[in-house]
Interface confidence: low
């Protein structure tokens, strides 16, 4: 049978089994989510894209799944990230009381996976899926992350932190999920401040990357939304993580502050 050929890689092999297994594991480890029925979660996930044209997925398609995966993060404990996922995840594994989107049920289920279906069939397409650039932006994976990222930002409160990659030419990128979705969905009535941590990724000079033009752009966007903005350089990510793990280490001085220069705006 003829099948549409997309530019992106196909659905991750054993996708249904992976989602179900991840759900079971997550609900076992997180007592507050033990009430979740993983079969219902999979059915809702499947319902968002199965038998639908994969370039015409909407946020509405994911609402049943979002409803089932409703979860709250305590105030001051939300960690957003952009182009530096691995370090953000290493950090929350050590600092157990902070949470990235991928530490929440829905983010955990979908992290690093690809999926799509086909119009009018109940099959999952393991051959190819739409590429965001080459095919379409309204594909199942992109719309999923846009939906859950929006929700994650909307529910954040207190001081929100974001890790940014100082090795990129655009440290803050308006086209990233953080720049295009999360920044605009932080709620000023609940969020007092956004604190950016600019990760130097091994860069060995002492430039203050908080003065980068793209960071100034982020500050401007955030300030216009009546949210205060702070920025810190983290010159040594390895040292930073080490000091989070072991704040008593004599080389860490006053906790994590030893590894970054504080810059207030």
């Amino acid at each position: 049978r003829w099948r549409q050929q997309w530019s992106g890689s196909g659905t991750t092999s054993r996708f249904p089994e992976t989602v179900l297994a991840r759900c079971v594991k997550y609900t076992e480890v997180h007592p507050e989510m033990r009430h979740v029925d993983c079969q219902s979660v999979w059915d809702a996930f499947k319902g968002a894209f199965i038998s639908k044209y994969p370039c015409n997925i909407t946020e509405e398609d994911y609402q049943p799944l979002v409803k089932l995966g409703t979860q709250t993060v305590p105030c001051n404990k939300t960690l957003l990230w952009s182009r530096i996922k691995d370090l953000a995840h290493q950090f929350t594994q050590v600092q157990r009381d902070m949470f990235t989107l991928e530490d929440m049920l829905l983010g955990y289920l979908a992290d690093d996976l690809t999926w799509c279906g086909e119009f009018n069939t109940f099959e999952i397409n393991y051959q190819s899926c739409p590429d965001w650039r080459k095919d379409c932006s309204n594909n199942p994976v992109s719309v999923f992350w846009k939906t859950v990222s929006r929700r994650f930002a909307e529910t954040a409160c207190g001081v929100v932190h974001v890790m940014l990659n100082g090795s990129r030419s655009k440290i803050f990128d308006k086209n990233s999920t953080f720049g295009s979705v999360e920044v605009h969905n932080l709620q000023p009535e609940k969020v007092q401040a956004l604190e950016a941590w600019v990760i130097h990724g091994g860069r060995e000079d002492s430039r203050d990357l908080c003065q980068d033009p793209t960071i100034k752009e982020l500050e401007s966007i955030i300030s216009k939304r009546n949210i205060r903005f702070f920025c810190k350089n983290i010159y040594r990510p390895d040292k930073f993580l080490q000091c989070v793990k072991n704040p008593e280490d004599s080389s860490c001085l006053s906790g994590i502050s030893a590894s970054h220069h504080h810059h207030h705006h």
Epitope: I199, G202, R203, E204
Partner: antibody, heavy 120, light 111 residues
Amino acid sequence: QVQLVQSGAEVVKPGASVKMSCKASGYTFTSFNMHWVKEAPGQRLEWIGYIYPGNGGTNYNQKFQGRATLTADTSASTAYMEISSLRSEDTAVYFCARTGGLRRAYFTYWGQGTLVTVSS
Amino acid sequence: DIVLTQSPATLSLSPGERATISCRASESVDSYGNGFMHWYQQKPGQPPRLLIYLASSRATGIPARFSGSGSGTDFTLTISPLEPEDFAVYYCQQNKEDPWTFGGGTKLEIK
């Protein structure tokens, strides 16, 4: 003492790829950037980019982005550079180099160089 | 990119004389009170060797006859008095901005 030992000379055909290595010893491999520098005949030295083995983070000179790939094997204290779609102008000696450390971004230690000859 | 222009391209001198090599940057390489300009010596078949870092600081083990000066866009490497082993190619390098760039080199040859 700090030592950077690079792999031997390579002769490769245009369009092919080459992967060279740089084995580090005498210091904590994960704590310092490993840079790569190109020296082509009659040309000025060119900085290709670096990898931070501590987290795999890379920073490339735009000119080499896409064709040069920097990786590191922390268990073997070895950094690698792969260059794809080779052409004659890639004929050069490639050096790995380490800087003095945090905020000391000048090249204190160098490998002996790997000569890559692109020839059909 | 910051372009570094070295002059002269070739310098012919005798041992005991004074060598002055200039490096001009297309824009200032000063930051945080430092000139992010460094100097290297390279001999045939060898990697470059760091001589001077941050415009004027001598690297470990480098003799006092090597000195660096300058700020902003204009930097100078001075070698005095010249020893026979100093005849080589000299490069300046900046790391104020990515991509880090090198000058075209100055060949110091025996007259």
